[in-house]
Interface confidence: low
């Protein structure tokens, strides 16, 4: 008499997480009499996944129905899979028995799940840096297999080249997941700047995922300063103007010193951006030069976004002979520029 | 993901008539198609199951009044030769009942049995 | 062959009430738990509101409950509301993959 044969017909079954794996069983003859068991593994440490004899196991039905006479197809549908149901499986033909007796095992099907890796996260540098520094971004997605997975950065639609990737873990596993950090050169003009991590993996059906950081966040435009005076008015006053150019973030406090004494502090808000996403902000200060007898050194001084004051002075010359308030006769002063 | 009937018409007594079920948004590899109909003023009545692989069953009743069988994203039902008390509402569903529930519904094909 | 048995044919309930309906299988349904619950409104498809005899689907509001093992099953909707005014059916699954069988319906009326 022929020796009974179980037959499972796929050496290797890939499904999409989240799908039904259809794992087929047949047998070669209904002799001897015993049921069919499924399990994932082999040997004593073997995870039974399915008992066509009894048993509950929610996630698995099999295909055609194990009660029916004749019936040699022991194939199973496992519902919901996840990165975690992979592995081989085996359809086991037990011999009926006080216990069943094991008879013979098919030679196993083995299950790889392709899982779509999460949307990737972007960081960027802790603290911010100023223009010509480097910094760097880190990208990571999870969950994902097969390890196959290929990751690219890109700076404004141009791909960047100084990446360094990982894909752990390094043997093989349910799922996995990929690390990447990209060093960025800023420059003053990446405000508006944008760095892309794009992962594209064979689960993705060539529609990459995409995680974005705005260098917005990472960089600092220090600001220009300029201090200048404008004519004098006919009532001895003159005005001088802080002008803070260029700068990012917003982030800004100019305080005023006449003779280094503050004068006035002004905090920067609601300020227009330029093209380039700085801002500019232009203070005024009236300067009594009736009140005057001597010289005034005014100081604007620049704190923009926590770090160490910017100064830029500038000498307010007062003529020996002040002229009266309301004098239409200008006062003999020239401005010095001092840093 | 969805399912539609189509091919539901009036037809005389004994004309093999043959429903469509188109799919669309999942895969007839990881799914069975059910049918199910209901006669007017009547309640729902399960035909069968188109599965994965070559496996059709259908209830008891309904064995030899039926046959199915599938495409890549179709899933037809034959109503080999239809009787009076054929005419009904036939709708498809994806599922196989149990842990894999009849979820989503085509919107129905109302085939009409008359001399 | 597996028979489902429904009660009652129909019920009436006002608007924040509660309705049950009962669905008895003349055996053991498939591991116990092979019973969903579906609504039907004229003139649309079916819906389906549990699966595994408790299991809510995606997408169905709380109120709407499946409890029961074996042979005995019942749905509730608790806080009803005009919207839910339908037919319920339970489906049962026997131990042969081709036993499914619906019960004869619950019609809720909703005042």
């Known amino acids: 008499e022929e020796e009974l044969q179980v037959i499972q017909p796929e050496k290797s079954v890939s499904v999409a997480a989240g799908d039904s794996a259809t794992l087929n069983c047949t047998v070669s003859s209904l002799i001897p009499v015993g049921p069919i068991q499924w399990f994932r593994g082999a040997g004593p440490g073997r995870e039974l996944i399915y008992n066509l004899k009894e048993g509950h196991f929610p996630r698995v039905t099999p295909v055609s129905d194990p009660t029916k006479r004749n019936n040699m197809d022991f194939s199973i549908r496992i519902s919901n899979i996840t990165p975690a149901d992979a592995g081989t499986y085996y359809c086991v033909k037990f011999r009926k028995g006080s216990p069943d007796v094991e008879l013979k095992s098919g030679a196993g099907t083995e299950l790889s799940v392709r899982a779509k890796p999460s949307a990737p996260v972007v960081s960027g540098p802790a603290v911010r840096a100023t223009a010509e520094h480097t910094v760097s971004f880190t990208c990571e997605s999870h969950g994902f297999s097969p390890r196959d997975i290929t990751l690219k950065w890109f700076k404004n639609g141009n791909e960047l080249s100084d990446v360094q990737t990982n894909v752990d873990p390094a043997g093989k596993s349910v799922s996995y997941s990929i690390r990447s950090t990209a060093r960025v050169v800023l420059t003053r003009r990446d405000v508006h700047s944008q760095v892309i991590c794009e992962v594209a993996h064979v689960t993705l059906q060539g529609d990459p995922l995409r995680g974005t950081a705005n260098l917005s966040e990472a960089i600092r435009v220090p600001p220009f300063l300029e201090v200048t005076q404008q004519s004098m008015r006919a009532d001895n006053q003159v005005n001088v103007t802080c002008q803070v150019t260029k700068f990012y973030p917003q982030r800004l406090q100019l305080t005023w010193l006449e003779n280094g004494n503050v004068s006035r502090t002004e905090m920067a808000s609601a300020l227009p951006e330029n093209k380039d996403g700085t801002y500019n902000w232009t203070s005024w200060l009236l300067v009594n030069v009736s009140a005057h007898r001597d010289d005034v050194k005014l100081t604007c001084q620049v704190e923009h976004d926590g770090q160490p004051a910017v100064n830029k002075s500038f000498s307010v010359k007062v003529s020996a002979h002040p002229k009266e308030q309301g004098s239409n006769t200008a006062a003999e002063n020239t401005g010095t520029n001092e840093r | 993901r969805s399912v539609e009937e189509s091919g539901g018409r009036l037809v005389t007594p004994g004309t093999p008539l043959t429903l469509t079920c188109t799919v669309s948004?999942?895969?007839?590899?990881?799914?069975?198609i059910s049918w199910v109909r209901q006669a007017p003023g009547k309640g729902l009545e399960y035909i069968g199951t188109?599965?994965?692989?070559?496996i059709t069953y259908f209830a008891s009743w309904a064995k030899g009044r039926f046959t199915g069988s599938k495409t890549s994203t179709t899933v037809d039902l034959k109503i080999t030769s239809p009787t009076t008390e054929d005419t009904a509402t036939y709708f498809c569903?994806?599922?196989?009942?149990?842990?894999?529930?009849?979820?989503?519904w085509g919107p129905g094909t109302l085939v009409t049995v008359s001399s | 062959a597996l028979v489902m048995t429904q009660t009652p044919a129909s019920v009436s309930a006002a608007v924040g009430g509660t309705v049950t309906t009962k669905c008895q299988a003349s055996?053991?349904?498939?591991?116990?738990?092979?019973l969903a619950w579906y609504q039907h409104k004229p003139g649309q498809p079916p819906k389906l509101l549990i699966y595994l005899a408790s299991t809510l689907a995606t997408g169905v509001p709380s109120r709407f409950s499946g409890s029961g093992s074996g042979t005995q099953f019942t749905l509730t909707i608790t806080g009803v509301q005009s919207d839910d005014a339908a037919t319920y059916y339970c489906l049962g699954g026997g131990d042969d993959e081709a036993d499914n069988v619906f019960g004869g319906g619950t019609e809720v009326v909703v005042k």
């Open positions: 055996q053991s349904v498939y591991g116990n738990n092979d």
């Open positions: 948004g999942f895969s007839l590899s990881s799914h069975g």
């Open positions: 569903a994806r599922g196989s009942a149990w842990n894999d529930p009849f979820d989503p």
């Open positions: 188109i599965g994965t692989g070559v």
